[in-house]
Amino acid sequence: MGRGVRVLLLLSLLHCAGGSEGRKTWRRRGQQPPPPPRTEAAPAAGQPVESFPLDFTAVEGNMDSFMAQVKSLAQSLYPCSAQQLNEDLRLHLLLNTSVTCNDGSPAGYYLKESRGSRRWLLFLEGGWYCFNRENCDSRYDTMRRLMSSRDWPRTRTGTGILSSQPEENPYWWNANMVFIPYCSSDVWSGASSKSEKNEYAFMGALIIQEVVRELLGRGLSGAKVLLLAGSSAGGTGVLLNVDRVAEQLEKLGYPAIQVRGLADSGWFLDNKQYRHTDCVDTITCAPTEAIRRGIRYWNGVVPERCRRQFQEGEEWNCFFGYKVYPTLRCPVFVVQWLFDEAQLTVDNVHLTGQPVQEGLRLYIQNLGRELRHTLKDVPASFAPACLSHEIIIRSHWTDVQVKGTSLPRALHCWDRSLHDSHKASKTPLKGCPVHLVDSCPWPHCNPSCPTVRDQFTGQEMNVAQFLMHMGFDMQTVAQPQGLEPSELLGMLSNGS
């Protein structure tokens, strides 16, 4: 397969959020574990009520019997509400038609209201970017949906964290769900409109502000918590916009709405590429150079407190999580695969199906180490040692665990920690961790990672096969664990 074809294929795989996941299969391994405890109680049919995480610490006597009764009650009530559940989010194009996609068509959002809830989840879609006329023209030809609203469907199905099914979304299933399609190609940072001089509009930052403004009239004004989430470029968009949203709500007279961020697969490193290439297209261009050019092209805006720290022309620094995160006021939960495919792509690492040479293997391992280091001072983080990209709107986002804790559970613990933050206690909640970063050093050393498929045969590979394919010498891998290679292979093959 030619390089260009492979890149296009990779891009299209990265773009089809919630669809077929390309090289990864999200499935449960063996027997399904019991779902994590729900953080919201199911509302009685026809009578939605706001609900809060249940705290059973006060329950005396037989906890098992109490929980059995709750489960039985929930099961008997669930069919009543399930019949009425419509998973679809409905498209609303912005009333203010001057806030547009790249091609001048109005931007918009998909909304599914949950009248009983005062929680609002606003999700920013991802999908790379373009940073000059040439690669934006090419993007318009091949990925128009990411530059125009003209062909958007009337509805979208909420998946993963946007799902209203408690089984699929034990974290926030009852929230008001908003999906904001990415059609500005500017990592949600732009503030420039289409004109005679500018062939394209880049209004990502303005789209978010306008969506928030319009949602205030649709019930957001009564919100208790607004969670701005996003994946990939949308994850970086969260870091760039979360404080501005909080500021906007404060200025509009809604200071009581707590704004938080959830950045998935948007925490990139401005590291040295594996092989340096000239900046000719989105994929080969080193991220620092792409963003440097992009900011000028988009009239990109970055958080003020970050901008202050860098010289004129150096604002690109603020697109990198580890530099912008410390300047943010709003709490942000960072989700990042330690071996992110998009990071590897911009670093010119292309896993072609051939066994990996030692130099590349060490580069990949070092990437995981560097990423882990940048997360050490991020109290709320979830970073599994997997080779993947994006997670939160995948249907099986509940499957991956770090140190025995799933992402929905970690997010629930984060909610609790923020709820309790006005109390003096600085210690993390017992048995409810929020800083979850894998410490094992190679890709897929975490057995709950999504299964890898061989890029060419389509066959599933178990972890042992994958590691050998990656050129890891089993002796080297087994030794630090105090194991024989055969024992390690057995353990990895069993997924333990």
Epitope: R305, R308, Q309, P326, T327, R329, C330, P331
Partner: antibody, heavy 121, light 113 residues
């Protein structure tokens, strides 16, 4: 350890200008900003301005027209210049380190010992 | 600009007594999204630079004795010295770091009887 030390002229005649240097050690001006604060004798503290790590500057709006802050990263020095001094500019002038990227505006954990500037004929 | 007011402007106490001083801001220093109050307290002993005691309204700077306690939220804040020692003779300032320019209160002068 983190240290800041101000050095200034001591005495300045009215309408003249003032130059103070803040020399830092234990950290780099590439990573941290430096803030200037003054305190008239027996009075409270007044923030004057900041030069951030990246070289951008912000001044107290009431003194903006008279103030100028600059730095030399390689020499670990920050400079405060103030012109058209009057007797009510008599004060102890302090430089203080900010918190880098972490919080801005900051609280001030590291201060210089201050340099007393007296404006008098 | 945010205006910071402190009271009392001075007070005299005996060693071992409990001292309470107050600081009021002209607008809320509580940032709702992270539940933090953007307020710090400093101690300035005669002839010395100010020394940081408390930030986030209630977090003690390392090395600061636990007899110093900060509390309050929004616009009203308090610094308490549970049992005054002779070495606590100083002027105490509060400072907001919610927005530029950072501003300080006029100070509370603590004298030992």
């Amino acid at each position: 350890q983190v240290q800041l030390k101000e050095s200034g002229p001591g005495l300045v005649a009215p309408s003249q200008s003032l130059s103070i240097t803040c020399t830092v050690s234990g950290f780099s001006l590439i990573n941290f900003g430096v803030q200037w604060i003054r305190q008239p004798p027996g009075k409270g503290l007044e923030w004057l301005g900041v030069i951030w790590a990246g070289g951008r500057i912000k001044y107290n709006s009431t003194l903006m027209s008279r103030l100028s802050i600059s730095k030399d990263n390689s020499k670990s020095q920050v400079f405060l210049k103030m012109n058209s001094l009057q007797t009510d500019d008599t004060a102890m002038y302090y430089c203080a380190r900010d918190l880098g990227l972490n919080w801005d505006p900051p609280w001030f954990a590291y201060w210089g010992q201050g340099t007393l500037v007296t404006v008098s004929a | 600009d945010i205006v910071m007011s402190q009271s009392p402007s001075s007070l005299a106490v005996s060693v071992g007594e409990k001292v309470t001083m107050r600081c009021k801001s002209s607008q809320s220093l509580l940032y709702n999204s992270n539940q933090k109050n953007y307020l710090a307290w400093y101690q300035q002993k005669p002839g010395q630079s100010p020394k940081l005691l408390i930030y986030w309204a209630s977090t003690r700077e390392s090395g600061v004795p636990d007899r110093f306690t900060g509390s309050g939220s929004g616009t009203d804040f308090t610094l308490i010295i549970s049992s005054v020692k002779a070495e606590d003779l100083a002027v105490y300032y509060c400072q907001q770091y919610d927005s530029y320019p950072p501003t300080f209160g006029g100070g509370t002068k603590l004298e030992i009887r």
